[in-house]
């Protein structure tokens, strides 16, 4: 566990010609705030895909009014750091999105108006516990200067916040084979000798490879809480107690959501649904009124004139959450056809089509026959994003360029002999059979199962199959 910290140093016009107009005016004073979104790895995700590592919103900056005729200066910034707590290991590589938002403070109906001023994004490698890294990013004519770092929360240490430190048991030195925990020299690196998977919160070990449970926990890895309602809770380090097991703890155990927020588990971690008046990763930000512009994504704020009265965000279609901060998963309906990949960009759905398909929902099957000829009188048939040739008799292969052997499939029945012919095949039937493929027996009395043979053909003669 740890915290990613972002410090915004300046936001203003970038170098070069074409300085941007000030986002604020005497008629429309405004103030800035920032949003950061973090994702693990260096993946090429859509900007609007979930902030799996977390997200944070800054406070509002000071109100700024443009001085008439003056160029747009660096704009006044909010105080403090943006902090994104992360629950698990720090991934080392991450993607970030930093958005600069403008809040207009004119006399809008329903509270202040919001608009996105700039968005920058990047991918970085960063070890936890290292120094501040400085960065400059440009978005159009704007320039954003910032620093960032990742730091571990005790007792975690290390570049991924996965090593644990414990206070020294002896004042002078660490135990055998254990190093001091830099930079916490008064602490020692915890021995990683317990059984693999042993719960760091509810288990401990005194011998390598064991996992002993604290009171109230059981199971081989001390991950199963002991129910006190149906049995006696054993004192001290427990063993598994029959009939007393309930499901093991999840990310919502102990409810990490503050201020009455409700917790729901996600595949990676947890998500808090906050009551009105609170927001943030753990519903920790409070005292919000409509004047603070708490409704994201064009949501309309109603009520909440003072910090003690609740506000309500009326969300536009496609957004939800107490602050309209969450997008409805429209891709779950799988609108993209033919195996296309769905991307929900908020303002629109996009489909990334597989080869051979096009259109807003990959609904057009591209005609791969265009510009491709099938040889020797073959006709092109399109389907599935690929073309194939339906070949004329006597030809085969992808483009009908290969001369087919019509006898390869042994088409002549009852021992008839097959002869390739320029326009097909000819079967020479064995005695007692007739027909184009020798499929009809000749009856012993001389009559056949067919009407009389066509003039000029006697039973037993080769029959040409056209």
């Amino acid at each position: 566990a740890g915290v990613f910290e972002l410090q915004i140093h300046s936001f203003g016009p970038g170098p070069g010609p074409g300085a941007p107009r000030s986002p604020c005016s005497a008629r429309l004073p405004c103030r800035l705030f920032f949003r950061v979104c973090l994702k693990p790895g260096l993946s090429e995700e859509a900007a609007e895909s979930p902030c799996a590592l977390g997200a944070a919103l800054s406070a509002r900056g000071p109100v700024y009014t443009e001085q008439p005729g003056a160029p747009a200066p660096d704009l006044p910034l909010p105080d403090g750091l943006l902090q994104v707590p992360f629950r698990d290991a720090w991934p080392g590589t991450f993607s970030f999105i930093i958005e600069t938002w403008r809040e207009e403070l004119g006399d809008q109906i329903g509270g202040p108006a919001w608009s996105l001023l700039a968005r920058v994004a990047g991918r970085r490698r960063l070890a936890a516990g290292g120094p501040w890294a400085r960065d400059i990013q440009r978005a159009g004519a704007w320039e954003l200067r910032f620093s960032y770092r990742a730091r571990c929360e005790p007792p975690a240490v290390g570049t991924a916040c996965t090593r644990l430190c414990r206070p020294r048991s002896a004042p002078s030195r660490c135990g055998p084979g254990l190093r001091p925990c830099a930079p916490l020299e008064d602490e020692c690196e915890a021995p990683l000798v317990c059984r693999a998977g042993c719960s760091p919160e509810h288990g401990f070990c005194e011998q390598p490879g064991e996992c002993r449970c604290l009171e109230g926990w059981t199971g081989p890895l001390c991950t199963v809480p002991v129910s006190t309602s149906s049995c006696l809770s054993p004192r001290g380090p427990s063993s598994a107690t029959t009939g007393c097991l309930v499901p093991g703890p999840g990310p919502c155990d102990g409810n990490p959501c503050a201020n009455g927020g409700s917790c729901s588990e996600t595949p990676r971690s947890f998500e808090c649904t906050c009551p009105r008046g609170f927001y943030g990763l753990r519903c920790e930000v409070s005292g919000v009124t409509c004047a603070d512009g708490p409704c994201f994504n064009g949501g309309l704020c109603v009520g909440g004139a003072d910090p003690d009265s609740a506000y309500i965000c009326h969300c536009p279609p496609g957004f939800q959450g107490s602050n309209c901060e969450k997008r409805v998963d429209r891709c779950s309906l799988q609108p993209c056809r033919n195996g296309g990949l769905c991307l929900d960009l908020g303002h629109a759905l996009r489909c990334r089509c597989r080869a051979g398909f096009a259109g807003p929902r990959c609904e057009h099957d591209l005609d791969d026959c265009a510009g491709r000829a099938c040889a020797n009188g073959g006709t092109c048939v399109e389907g599935g994003g690929a073309h194939r040739c339906s070949c004329a008799l006597g030809f085969g292969g992808r483009d009908c360029r290969e001369r087919a052997d019509p006898c390869a499939a042994r088409p002549c029945a009852h021992g008839g002999r097959c002869y390739a012919h320029f326009s097909g095949l000819v079967c020479a039937c064995a005695p007692g059979y007739m027909g184009a493929r020798c499929e009809f027996p000749v009856h012993p009395d001389g009559a056949s199962a067919l009407p009389a043979a066509p003039p000029g053909l006697r039973p037993g003669d080769p029959q040409r199959y056209l």
Epitope: G318, R330, L333, Q334, P335, R337, G340, L349, R361, E363
Partner: nanobody
Framework: EVQLVESGGGEVQPGGSLRLSCAAS????????MGWYRQAPGKQRELVAG???????KYAESVKGRFTISRDNAKNTVYLQMSSLRAEDTGVYYC??????????????WGQGTLVTVKP
């Protein structure tokens, strides 16, 4: 502009049934995908059942075997037959449609929602 009008919501006892309807009207060239989402109090809006862009039916795990989605293409309408209703099925049910308004232009539309309450 396309309108989606839902109907059929109401209050029912556990184990009971309801049938929701959603009719699409307006400038519709064709309907690409259409289905039902629900939003329970304090929860996220989630897909319940729908017809995908490829015309397949899709159901949330929690409703499989209890809910059935059907459609009348001539009327641009989808139906959700809900049986063996449970308390956790309570919520506002929203119709959603991904609609081609002409051959190459498609947009997503939501209905206003219809409330389903399951209580003894």
């Amino acid at each position: 502009e396309v309108q989606l009008v839902e109907s059929g919501g109401g209050e029912v006892q556990p184990g009971g049934s309801l049938r929701l309807s959603c009719a699409a009207s307006g400038s519709i060239f064709s309907i690409n995908a259409m289905g039902w989402y629900r939003q329970a109090p304090g929860k996220q809006r989630e897909l319940v059942a729908g017809f995908t862009g490829d015309g397949m039916t899709k159901y949330a795990e929690s409703v499989k075997g209890r809910f059935t989605i059907s459609r009348d293409n001539a009327k641009n309408t989808v139906y959700l037959q809900m049986s063996s209703l449970r308390a956790e099925d309570t919520g506002v049910y929203y119709c959603a449609a991904d609609v081609f308004t002409d051959r190459d232009h498609v947009d997503w539309y939501w209905g206003q929602g219809t409330l389903v309450t399951v209580k003894p």
